[in-house]
Amino acid sequence: SAPFSFLSNVKYNFMRIIKYEFILNDALNQSIIRANDQYLTAAALHNLDEAVKFDMGAYKSSKDDAKITVILRISKTQLYVTAQDEDQPVLLKEMPEIPKTITGSETNLLFFWETHGTKNYFTSVAHPNLFIATKQDYWVCLAGGPPSITDFQILENQA
Protein backbone atom coordinates (compact mmCIF):
# COMPACT_ATOMS: atom_id res chain seq x y z
CA SER A 1 0.00 0.00 0.00
CA ALA A 2 1.15 3.54 -0.69
CA PRO A 3 2.78 5.33 2.25
CA PHE A 4 0.61 7.89 4.01
CA SER A 5 2.74 10.78 2.79
CA PHE A 6 2.12 9.90 -0.85
CA LEU A 7 -1.61 10.20 -0.28
CA SER A 8 -1.38 13.64 1.29
CA ASN A 9 -1.03 16.92 -0.53
CA VAL A 10 1.70 18.28 1.71
CA LYS A 11 4.15 20.43 -0.20
CA TYR A 12 7.69 20.93 1.07
CA ASN A 13 9.52 24.11 0.08
CA PHE A 14 13.30 24.42 0.22
CA MET A 15 14.54 26.95 2.80
CA ARG A 16 18.32 26.75 2.84
CA ILE A 17 21.32 24.55 3.51
CA ILE A 18 21.68 24.42 7.30
CA LYS A 19 24.76 22.18 7.61
CA TYR A 20 27.79 21.58 5.43
CA GLU A 21 30.33 18.77 5.35
CA PHE A 22 29.39 16.71 8.38
CA ILE A 23 30.06 13.04 9.00
CA LEU A 24 27.53 10.52 10.29
CA ASN A 25 28.76 7.92 12.79
CA ASP A 26 26.47 5.18 14.03
CA ALA A 27 26.20 3.92 17.61
CA LEU A 28 29.05 1.45 16.97
CA ASN A 29 31.21 4.42 15.91
CA GLN A 30 31.15 3.29 12.31
CA SER A 31 31.23 6.08 9.74
CA ILE A 32 29.10 6.12 6.62
CA ILE A 33 31.23 5.60 3.51
CA ARG A 34 30.57 5.10 -0.20
CA ALA A 35 30.09 1.43 -1.09
CA ASN A 36 29.82 2.17 -4.82
CA ASP A 37 28.19 4.70 -7.16
CA GLN A 38 24.72 3.89 -5.88
CA TYR A 39 24.94 2.69 -2.29
CA LEU A 40 26.37 3.66 1.09
CA THR A 41 27.73 1.41 3.83
CA ALA A 42 29.26 1.82 7.30
CA ALA A 43 32.77 1.01 8.44
CA ALA A 44 35.06 1.70 11.40
CA LEU A 45 37.61 4.18 10.10
CA HIS A 46 41.02 5.23 11.39
CA ASN A 47 41.06 8.10 8.93
CA LEU A 48 37.86 10.13 8.81
CA ASP A 49 38.90 11.58 5.44
CA GLU A 50 37.43 8.40 3.95
CA ALA A 51 34.01 9.08 5.46
CA VAL A 52 31.23 10.57 3.35
CA LYS A 53 30.69 14.27 4.04
CA PHE A 54 27.04 15.35 3.91
CA ASP A 55 25.23 18.64 3.52
CA MET A 56 21.79 19.08 5.05
CA GLY A 57 19.08 21.20 3.45
CA ALA A 58 15.97 22.27 5.36
CA TYR A 59 12.42 22.27 3.99
CA LYS A 60 9.28 23.89 5.33
CA SER A 61 5.99 22.10 4.83
CA SER A 62 2.78 23.69 3.61
CA LYS A 63 1.07 22.68 6.86
CA ASP A 64 2.18 23.90 10.28
CA ASP A 65 4.85 21.28 10.83
CA ALA A 66 6.21 20.21 14.20
CA LYS A 67 9.07 18.36 12.50
CA ILE A 68 12.33 19.51 10.97
CA THR A 69 12.34 18.13 7.43
CA VAL A 70 15.66 17.77 5.61
CA ILE A 71 17.34 16.52 2.49
CA LEU A 72 20.79 14.88 2.64
CA ARG A 73 23.30 15.54 -0.12
CA ILE A 74 26.84 14.26 -0.46
CA SER A 75 29.00 17.36 -0.19
CA LYS A 76 30.46 18.78 -3.41
CA THR A 77 28.26 16.46 -5.51
CA GLN A 78 24.74 16.37 -6.91
CA LEU A 79 23.96 13.06 -5.19
CA TYR A 80 21.02 12.92 -2.78
CA VAL A 81 20.09 10.18 -0.30
CA THR A 82 16.84 8.59 -1.42
CA ALA A 83 14.67 6.16 0.52
CA GLN A 84 13.32 2.96 -0.97
CA ASP A 85 11.35 0.37 1.02
CA GLU A 86 11.96 -1.34 4.35
CA ASP A 87 15.28 -3.22 4.49
CA GLN A 88 16.17 -1.88 1.04
CA PRO A 89 19.37 0.14 0.68
CA VAL A 90 19.02 3.88 0.36
CA LEU A 91 20.01 5.06 -3.11
CA LEU A 92 22.16 7.95 -4.21
CA LYS A 93 20.12 9.86 -6.75
CA GLU A 94 21.76 12.40 -9.03
CA MET A 95 19.89 15.64 -9.61
CA PRO A 96 21.11 18.80 -11.34
CA GLU A 97 20.08 21.02 -8.43
CA ILE A 98 18.44 20.84 -5.05
CA PRO A 99 14.65 20.60 -5.54
CA LYS A 100 12.87 23.85 -4.72
CA THR A 101 9.58 22.06 -4.05
CA ILE A 102 8.95 18.44 -3.12
CA THR A 103 5.60 16.71 -3.01
CA GLY A 104 3.96 13.33 -3.63
CA SER A 105 6.26 10.44 -4.52
CA GLU A 106 9.33 12.70 -4.38
CA THR A 107 9.08 12.73 -0.58
CA ASN A 108 11.43 9.74 -0.65
CA LEU A 109 14.14 12.43 -0.82
CA LEU A 110 13.09 13.88 2.53
CA PHE A 111 13.73 12.87 6.13
CA PHE A 112 12.44 14.08 9.47
CA TRP A 113 15.53 15.00 11.48
CA GLU A 114 15.17 14.33 15.18
CA THR A 115 17.78 14.95 17.86
CA HIS A 116 17.93 13.71 21.43
CA GLY A 117 21.16 14.46 23.23
CA THR A 118 23.97 13.28 20.97
CA LYS A 119 21.66 10.95 19.05
CA ASN A 120 20.32 11.92 15.63
CA TYR A 121 17.56 10.06 13.81
CA PHE A 122 16.47 10.41 10.20
CA THR A 123 12.95 9.12 9.58
CA SER A 124 11.76 8.77 5.99
CA VAL A 125 8.95 11.20 5.16
CA ALA A 126 7.68 8.67 2.64
CA HIS A 127 7.81 5.83 5.21
CA PRO A 128 7.36 7.53 8.59
CA ASN A 129 8.02 4.41 10.66
CA LEU A 130 11.37 3.73 8.99
CA PHE A 131 14.77 5.27 9.73
CA ILE A 132 18.06 5.57 7.89
CA ALA A 133 20.00 2.72 9.44
CA THR A 134 23.21 0.73 9.31
CA LYS A 135 23.20 -3.03 9.35
CA GLN A 136 26.06 -5.46 9.76
CA ASP A 137 27.50 -6.59 6.40
CA TYR A 138 24.89 -4.60 4.50
CA TRP A 139 24.35 -1.24 2.91
CA VAL A 140 22.89 1.77 4.65
CA CYS A 141 19.17 1.05 4.43
CA LEU A 142 15.72 1.91 5.77
CA ALA A 143 14.79 0.00 8.90
CA GLY A 144 12.29 0.11 11.74
CA GLY A 145 14.81 -0.59 14.49
CA PRO A 146 17.05 -3.38 15.87
CA PRO A 147 19.06 -5.26 14.78
CA SER A 148 19.73 -2.28 12.52
CA ILE A 149 21.28 0.82 14.11
CA THR A 150 19.13 3.91 13.67
CA ASP A 151 20.89 6.53 15.81
CA PHE A 152 23.78 8.59 14.52
CA GLN A 153 26.21 11.13 15.83
CA ILE A 154 26.86 14.20 13.70
CA LEU A 155 30.54 15.11 13.50
CA GLU A 156 31.04 18.66 12.30
CA ASN A 157 34.00 20.81 11.27
CA GLN A 158 36.12 17.90 10.13
CA ALA A 159 39.17 19.50 8.53
Epitope: F4, I68, H116
Partner: antibody, heavy 118, light 113 residues
Framework: QVQLVQSGAEVKKPGSSVKVSCKAS????????ILWVRQAPGQGLQWLGG????????DHAQDFQDRLTITVDESMTTAYMELSSLRPEDTAIYYC???????????WGQGTLVTVSS | DIVMTQSPDFLAVSLGERATINCKSS????????????LAWYQQKAGQPPKLLIY???TRESGVPDRFSGSGSATDFTLTISSLQAEDVAVYYC?????????FGQGTRLEIK
Protein backbone atom coordinates in the same frame (compact mmCIF):
# COMPACT_ATOMS: atom_id res chain seq x y z
CA GLN B 1 26.75 15.56 27.93
CA VAL B 2 25.68 19.20 27.80
CA GLN B 3 25.41 21.08 31.09
CA LEU B 4 23.56 24.38 31.27
CA VAL B 5 24.81 27.03 33.69
CA GLN B 6 22.63 30.10 34.20
CA SER B 7 23.52 33.55 35.48
CA GLY B 8 22.90 34.50 39.09
CA ALA B 9 19.84 35.81 40.91
CA GLU B 10 18.60 39.32 40.09
CA VAL B 11 16.54 41.89 41.98
CA LYS B 12 14.86 44.38 39.67
CA LYS B 13 12.60 47.39 39.93
CA PRO B 14 9.19 47.41 38.19
CA GLY B 15 9.47 48.77 34.65
CA SER B 16 13.10 47.70 34.24
CA SER B 17 14.55 44.79 32.21
CA VAL B 18 16.42 41.64 33.09
CA LYS B 19 18.76 39.58 30.92
CA VAL B 20 19.43 35.98 31.95
CA SER B 21 22.22 33.96 30.33
CA CYS B 22 22.42 30.21 29.82
CA LYS B 23 25.84 28.78 28.99
CA ALA B 24 26.27 25.30 27.54
CA SER B 25 29.37 23.47 28.67
CA UNK B 26 30.36 20.20 27.04
CA UNK B 27 28.52 21.05 23.83
CA UNK B 28 26.79 23.67 21.73
CA UNK B 29 23.21 24.52 20.87
CA UNK B 30 23.78 23.88 17.15
CA UNK B 31 21.40 20.94 16.73
CA UNK B 32 18.92 21.83 19.44
CA UNK B 33 15.93 23.96 20.26
CA ILE B 34 16.25 26.11 23.39
CA LEU B 35 13.26 26.64 25.67
CA TRP B 36 12.80 29.29 28.33
CA VAL B 37 10.38 28.30 31.09
CA ARG B 38 9.50 30.09 34.30
CA GLN B 39 8.03 29.06 37.62
CA ALA B 40 6.44 31.57 39.97
CA PRO B 41 6.72 30.78 43.70
CA GLY B 42 4.62 27.70 44.51
CA GLN B 43 3.28 27.56 40.94
CA GLY B 44 3.64 25.31 37.89
CA LEU B 45 5.77 25.59 34.75
CA GLN B 46 5.06 28.25 32.12
CA TRP B 47 6.70 28.36 28.68
CA LEU B 48 7.90 31.84 27.71
CA GLY B 49 9.42 31.13 24.34
CA GLY B 50 12.24 29.43 22.52
CA UNK B 51 14.67 29.52 19.65
CA UNK B 52 15.99 27.03 17.11
CA UNK B 53 19.39 28.58 16.37
CA UNK B 54 20.08 26.58 13.22
CA UNK B 55 17.04 28.28 11.66
CA UNK B 56 17.44 31.54 13.56
CA UNK B 57 13.76 31.10 14.37
CA UNK B 58 12.31 32.50 17.60
CA ASP B 59 8.94 31.59 19.08
CA HIS B 60 7.15 33.43 21.89
CA ALA B 61 4.14 32.79 24.04
CA GLN B 62 1.48 35.38 23.19
CA ASP B 63 1.60 36.96 26.67
CA PHE B 64 5.28 37.82 26.26
CA GLN B 65 5.38 38.70 22.55
CA ASP B 66 6.13 42.41 23.09
CA ARG B 67 8.61 42.24 25.94
CA LEU B 68 10.61 39.03 25.45
CA THR B 69 13.83 38.77 23.44
CA ILE B 70 15.62 35.44 22.99
CA THR B 71 19.07 35.30 21.38
CA VAL B 72 22.05 32.97 21.01
CA ASP B 73 25.66 34.08 20.64
CA GLU B 74 27.66 33.36 17.48
CA SER B 75 29.59 30.49 19.07
CA MET B 76 26.25 28.79 19.81
CA THR B 77 27.33 28.22 23.41
CA THR B 78 25.34 30.88 25.28
CA ALA B 79 21.64 31.70 25.05
CA TYR B 80 20.01 34.82 26.47
CA MET B 81 16.50 35.70 27.59
CA GLU B 82 15.67 39.36 28.11
CA LEU B 83 12.36 40.38 29.64
CA SER B 84 11.44 44.06 29.68
CA SER B 85 8.78 46.18 31.41
CA LEU B 86 9.03 43.98 34.48
CA ARG B 87 6.15 43.77 36.93
CA PRO B 88 5.97 42.17 40.40
CA GLU B 89 4.12 39.18 38.94
CA ASP B 90 7.22 38.37 36.84
CA THR B 91 8.93 37.28 40.06
CA ALA B 92 9.86 33.67 39.34
CA ILE B 93 12.62 31.18 38.74
CA TYR B 94 13.58 31.29 35.05
CA TYR B 95 14.93 28.10 33.45
CA CYS B 96 16.58 27.37 30.13
CA UNK B 97 16.36 23.87 28.69
CA UNK B 98 17.62 22.12 25.56
CA UNK B 99 18.75 18.74 24.20
CA UNK B 100 16.39 18.10 21.30
CA UNK B 101 15.34 19.86 18.13
CA UNK B 102 11.76 19.43 19.35
CA UNK B 103 10.57 21.73 22.12
CA UNK B 104 11.07 19.47 25.12
CA UNK B 105 13.83 19.76 27.72
CA UNK B 106 16.42 17.04 28.14
CA UNK B 107 19.03 19.26 29.79
CA TRP B 108 17.97 22.02 32.21
CA GLY B 109 19.80 24.94 33.76
CA GLN B 110 19.80 25.31 37.53
CA GLY B 111 17.38 28.24 37.33
CA THR B 112 17.73 31.96 37.92
CA LEU B 113 15.59 33.67 40.52
CA VAL B 114 14.34 37.06 39.33
CA THR B 115 12.65 39.17 41.97
CA VAL B 116 10.73 42.27 40.88
CA SER B 117 10.09 44.63 43.74
CA SER B 118 10.00 48.35 44.37
CA ASP C 1 -3.74 26.85 22.60
CA ILE C 2 -3.67 23.22 23.68
CA VAL C 3 -4.76 22.96 27.32
CA MET C 4 -3.14 20.16 29.33
CA THR C 5 -5.15 18.95 32.34
CA GLN C 6 -3.63 16.57 34.87
CA SER C 7 -5.46 14.45 37.40
CA PRO C 8 -5.33 14.18 40.28
CA ASP C 9 -3.76 17.40 41.60
CA PHE C 10 -2.53 15.50 44.63
CA LEU C 11 -1.78 11.80 45.05
CA ALA C 12 -0.74 9.85 48.15
CA VAL C 13 0.43 6.28 47.58
CA SER C 14 1.99 3.70 49.89
CA LEU C 15 5.59 2.64 49.34
CA GLY C 16 5.77 -0.27 46.88
CA GLU C 17 2.31 0.49 45.48
CA ARG C 18 1.44 1.68 41.99
CA ALA C 19 0.99 5.40 41.28
CA THR C 20 -0.94 6.57 38.23
CA ILE C 21 -1.08 10.15 36.95
CA ASN C 22 -3.30 11.13 34.05
CA CYS C 23 -2.89 13.91 31.51
CA LYS C 24 -5.54 15.00 29.04
CA SER C 25 -4.93 17.39 26.14
CA SER C 26 -7.69 19.59 24.73
CA UNK C 27 -6.77 18.43 21.23
CA UNK C 28 -4.78 15.57 19.78
CA UNK C 29 -0.97 15.70 20.05
CA UNK C 30 -0.61 12.70 17.72
CA UNK C 31 1.17 13.85 14.58
CA UNK C 32 -0.17 12.03 11.52
CA UNK C 33 3.02 12.33 9.45
CA UNK C 34 5.10 10.19 11.81
CA UNK C 35 2.50 8.62 14.11
CA UNK C 36 4.16 10.04 17.21
CA UNK C 37 2.64 11.66 20.27
CA UNK C 38 4.34 14.94 21.09
CA LEU C 39 4.12 14.56 24.85
CA ALA C 40 6.75 14.58 27.62
CA TRP C 41 6.66 13.87 31.36
CA TYR C 42 8.88 15.59 33.93
CA GLN C 43 9.65 15.06 37.59
CA GLN C 44 10.46 18.08 39.73
CA LYS C 45 11.78 17.70 43.26
CA ALA C 46 11.78 20.60 45.72
CA GLY C 47 14.41 23.21 44.90
CA GLN C 48 15.48 21.50 41.67
CA PRO C 49 14.83 22.04 37.95
CA PRO C 50 12.49 19.61 36.19
CA LYS C 51 13.96 16.30 35.04
CA LEU C 52 12.85 14.61 31.82
CA LEU C 53 11.37 11.15 32.46
CA ILE C 54 9.49 10.30 29.26
CA TYR C 55 9.33 11.77 25.75
CA UNK C 56 7.28 10.82 22.68
CA UNK C 57 4.66 9.77 25.29
CA UNK C 58 6.30 6.42 26.01
CA THR C 59 10.08 6.58 25.46
CA ARG C 60 11.87 6.42 28.78
CA GLU C 61 14.87 8.71 29.07
CA SER C 62 18.21 7.01 29.60
CA GLY C 63 18.97 6.50 33.29
CA VAL C 64 15.34 6.74 34.39
CA PRO C 65 14.35 3.65 36.45
CA ASP C 66 12.12 1.20 34.59
CA ARG C 67 9.41 1.52 37.23
CA PHE C 68 8.46 4.71 35.34
CA SER C 69 6.43 4.18 32.17
CA GLY C 70 4.37 6.38 29.88
CA SER C 71 1.39 5.31 27.82
CA GLY C 72 -1.57 6.70 25.89
CA SER C 73 -2.22 8.34 22.57
CA ALA C 74 -3.88 11.36 20.95
CA THR C 75 -5.49 13.13 23.93
CA ASP C 76 -5.23 10.76 26.91
CA PHE C 77 -1.93 9.90 28.56
CA THR C 78 -0.76 8.17 31.71
CA LEU C 79 2.44 8.18 33.73
CA THR C 80 2.74 5.04 35.86
CA ILE C 81 5.18 4.34 38.67
CA SER C 82 4.87 0.59 39.16
CA SER C 83 6.32 0.43 42.68
CA LEU C 84 6.62 3.73 44.52
CA GLN C 85 9.96 4.50 46.17
CA ALA C 86 10.65 7.22 48.76
CA GLU C 87 12.78 9.16 46.23
CA ASP C 88 9.79 9.46 43.86
CA VAL C 89 8.18 12.14 46.06
CA ALA C 90 7.95 15.11 43.69
CA VAL C 91 5.66 17.12 41.45
CA TYR C 92 5.06 15.57 38.01
CA TYR C 93 4.22 17.56 34.89
CA CYS C 94 3.10 16.59 31.41
CA UNK C 95 3.99 18.85 28.47
CA UNK C 96 2.88 18.94 24.85
CA UNK C 97 5.33 20.01 22.15
CA UNK C 98 2.98 19.35 19.25
CA UNK C 99 2.12 22.99 18.62
CA UNK C 100 2.95 26.47 19.81
CA UNK C 101 2.57 27.71 22.41
CA UNK C 102 4.18 24.86 24.32
CA UNK C 103 1.95 24.05 27.29
CA PHE C 104 2.32 22.15 30.55
CA GLY C 105 -0.17 20.44 32.80
CA GLN C 106 -0.76 22.13 36.17
CA GLY C 107 1.26 19.43 37.96
CA THR C 108 0.48 16.48 40.24
CA ARG C 109 2.03 16.41 43.70
CA LEU C 110 2.95 12.86 44.69
CA GLU C 111 3.51 11.97 48.34
CA ILE C 112 3.92 8.84 50.44
CA LYS C 113 0.80 7.60 52.24
Amino acid sequence: QVQLVQSGAEVKKPGSSVKVSCKASGGRFTNYAILWVRQAPGQGLQWLGGIIPIFDETDHAQDFQDRLTITVDESMTTAYMELSSLRPEDTAIYYCATGSNSYYGLYWGQGTLVTVSS
Amino acid sequence: DIVMTQSPDFLAVSLGERATINCKSSQSVLYSSDNKNYLAWYQQKAGQPPKLLIYWASTRESGVPDRFSGSGSATDFTLTISSLQAEDVAVYYCQQYYSLPITFGQGTRLEIK
